[in-house]
Interface confidence: low
Amino acid sequence: QEGKFSGPLKPMTFSIYEGQEPSQIIFQFKANPPAVTFELTGETDNIFVIEREGLLYYNRALDRETRSTHNLQVAALDANGIIVEGPVPITIKVKDINDNRPTFLQSKYEGSVRQNSRPGKPFLYVNATDLDDPATPNGQLYYQIVIQLPMINNVMYFQINNKTGAISLTREGSQELNPAKNPSYNLVISVKDMGGQSENSFSDTTSVDIIVTENIWKAPKPVEMVENSTDPHPIKITQVRWNDPGAQYSLVDKEKLPRFPFSIDQEGDIYVTQPLDREEKDAYVFYAVAKDEYGKPLSYPLEIHVKVKDINDNPPTCPSPVTVFEVQENERLGNSIGTLTAHDRDEENTANSFLNYRIVEQTPKLPMDGLFLIQTYAGMLQLAKQSLKKQDTPQYNLTIEVSDKDFKTLCFVQINVIDINDQIPIFEKSDYGNLTLAEDTNIGSTILTIQATDADEPFTGSSKILYHIIKGDSEGRLGVDTDPHTNTGYVIIKKPLDFETAAVSNIVFKAENPEPLVFGVKYNASSFAKFTLIVTDVNEAPQFSQHVFQAKVSEDVAIGTKVGNVTAKDPEGLDISYSLRGDTRGWLKIDHVTGEIFSVAPLDREAGSPYRVQVVATEVGGSSLSSVSEFHLILMDVNDNPPRLAKDYTGLFFCHPLSAPGSLIFEATDDDQHLFRGPHFTFSLGSGSLQNDWEVSKINGTHARLSTRHTEFEEREYVVLIRINDGGRPPLEGIVSLPVTFCSCVEGSCFRPAGHQTGIPTVGM
């Protein structure tokens, strides 16, 4: 069969499975005169043979793990043994079979994990090797936890990454592990080749002993600090401690106070830096943060609570320089004249702010002293001995001592004796007729003037008139302001008039005095007046129930999901049609009739959240008036962005030959939301075949170091694949490539002879 098993001498490649006894020839080379015989050289390993006539075969089973490629040369010789053709390269590629079992590098592993560690964050790696080809299932390893001891309530506290062997806590482990209850655990881990998918896979097991250590990164108890401390500052008030030394501590003032009187040192001790004033601020809440040397948070921040304890450092204060009360001539004994309300800035409902009232002087003392008394704790003044006569003494002045447990303050009260209120207010008109207004009349407009008079003593509470609308305006659309000099009442619009709900209103006013009428005198019809308000229709635009509508959905909701709804009403009762405006991303549609809003395309938080559009409500029919409101859609993050390199890393190079193993640092990022703690990426090599040459080690949640394992590199470009996992839910993995060039250097830079290829690396390591 010319061409498949025989033919002329030319470069050829053959693939042969390892471990199989020879069953057929490899190839029959045909000689072209003057060639008469063939010769085989190269990596024959005494396995490959060529007969003089050109028959190439092998005499025993191959082993890929000994040599995966045999580079042979075949030459054709003439009768004198001189090479007349060739030699040509013949490549034998040895194909892998699963003839090696995986083996753990250690029969026992030991590690420790801190309670409350983040679920999914590796704290220990087990590692197995398999001599078979990692590019085939034969060398693809699959790790599993066989058993966890002890197992409490059948709950797994630990998990393993099937591919990398990274052991981490489960969510339950993060919440429930407690060294006080159970300080140690044992795991039996198995590794299988064939990716764990075949019954014929080989396996190995190892034992992992895990110690659970206490997490001392805990919020301290709330602190109480007495205000106005005279001790030397700063004063230590509490402390936090990261689990390991070397953390960088800082405080975060979430309230953004103009004066933040706390500090933290690099031991984690928290201090108050100056005296506090409870009356300025009675409590502080701030956060303590621990960061690593790169400024990355090591864990969640701790909330620190400081309560400021009150001392009695404020005296009582009077409500005004002089407090004025009125009392009628005929008031009965015990009647209330008014209440003096003093203030104290110290803490409410404590002895520091509990006030006592006492009258220390009455002037004049006519017809006698002690005409008034004050309730000790309430501050209410009462008539104590007899009715007063204006013609004898029209005015009394009282000095009142107000005291807390340490301070005393004097307050002054003026009591005016006024004529008895025996005259009622009388309206000059009992009916103010009809008034017609459009429903869009401006708020604040005066629409009517009313007038009543009172014959009691002018400029006292007996003659002052207050107007009330007692009927016909349950919505409170109208109000009445009184001129204190003339007792004229001005009827004003306080809220918009509305033809649709109140086209005609029959309004009734009542005029009354702030002072009570004397016994036996009552308000009668003379103190009442009416008018009729007629409201005319104005076609109004629809009204939304809110200025801004807000909804919150996950960014991965299915297309067609209802994400929110808006509502508007037309004052005239017309139907409304809803539409959207400004949906620049084409994500939403609105039901014209119901106002329900649906997604019509995949949403993406990373494109911007909240997503803001306008909703328009338009009258159907009528004048087609419309109103606009805002709809804000807050998109909640899902882990839908794999990690990637934070910048372009082309141009990395090492000077060849390496004098010692070298390393370089790279940074990863992704576009998902990372709250206070930032991303927590894990890094590994992208394929098993890289492990002989390279090593990747995590520096922190975003940075890792790529190091060479030896110095024997060729002078060329290597593309190192790195696997970056974000540990999210679900975890996403990105495989990135770091191109690293090994090149001859001149003065620390890559040397390229003229005419060499472009793309000279620019970053030396």
């Epitope: 800082s250 790169y294 400024g295 640092i665 940074e667 940075h703």
Partner: nanobody, 118 residues
């Protein structure tokens, strides 16, 4: 608003020296301070950087051994001592606050001119 204020520079003879200073209106924890420069018609390039603790300095290959970056009198100041100046050192020198190994610049100064010429 936080600002960076550079001073120093001017006209210098080849082989001569000058000193640039930069003061920030606030102190940055975990942020490094350093210098970049832009020669006429070229892109802005990294020159030198001092880590925020002041214990680690980095230099570009072109200035290594000639320039020294150091902390000023305060945590929020940085100096650049420039010796053995060459005409190719001519350009506008910018003070910057950077973060992390990627030297991502969070804040730029206004820049100060250095001209090396005889």
């Amino acid at each position: 608003q936080v600002q960076l204020q550079e001073s120093g520079g001017g006209l210098v003879q080849p082989g001569g020296s000058t000193r640039l200073s930069c003061v920030s209106s606030r102190t940055f924890s975990y942020y490094d301070m350093g210098w970049f420069r832009q020669a006429p018609g070229k892109e802005r390039e990294f020159v030198a950087l001092l880590s925020w603790r002041g214990n680690n300095a980095e230099y570009s290959d072109s200035v290594h051994g000639r320039f020294t970056v150091s902390r000023g009198n305060t945590q929020n100041s940085v100096n650049l001592q420039m010796n053995n100046l060459k005409p190719e050192d001519t350009g506008i020198y910018y003070c910057a606050v950077t973060y992390g190994v990627a030297r991502s610049v969070r804040l730029w100064g206004q820049g100060t001119q250095v001209t090396v010429s005889s």
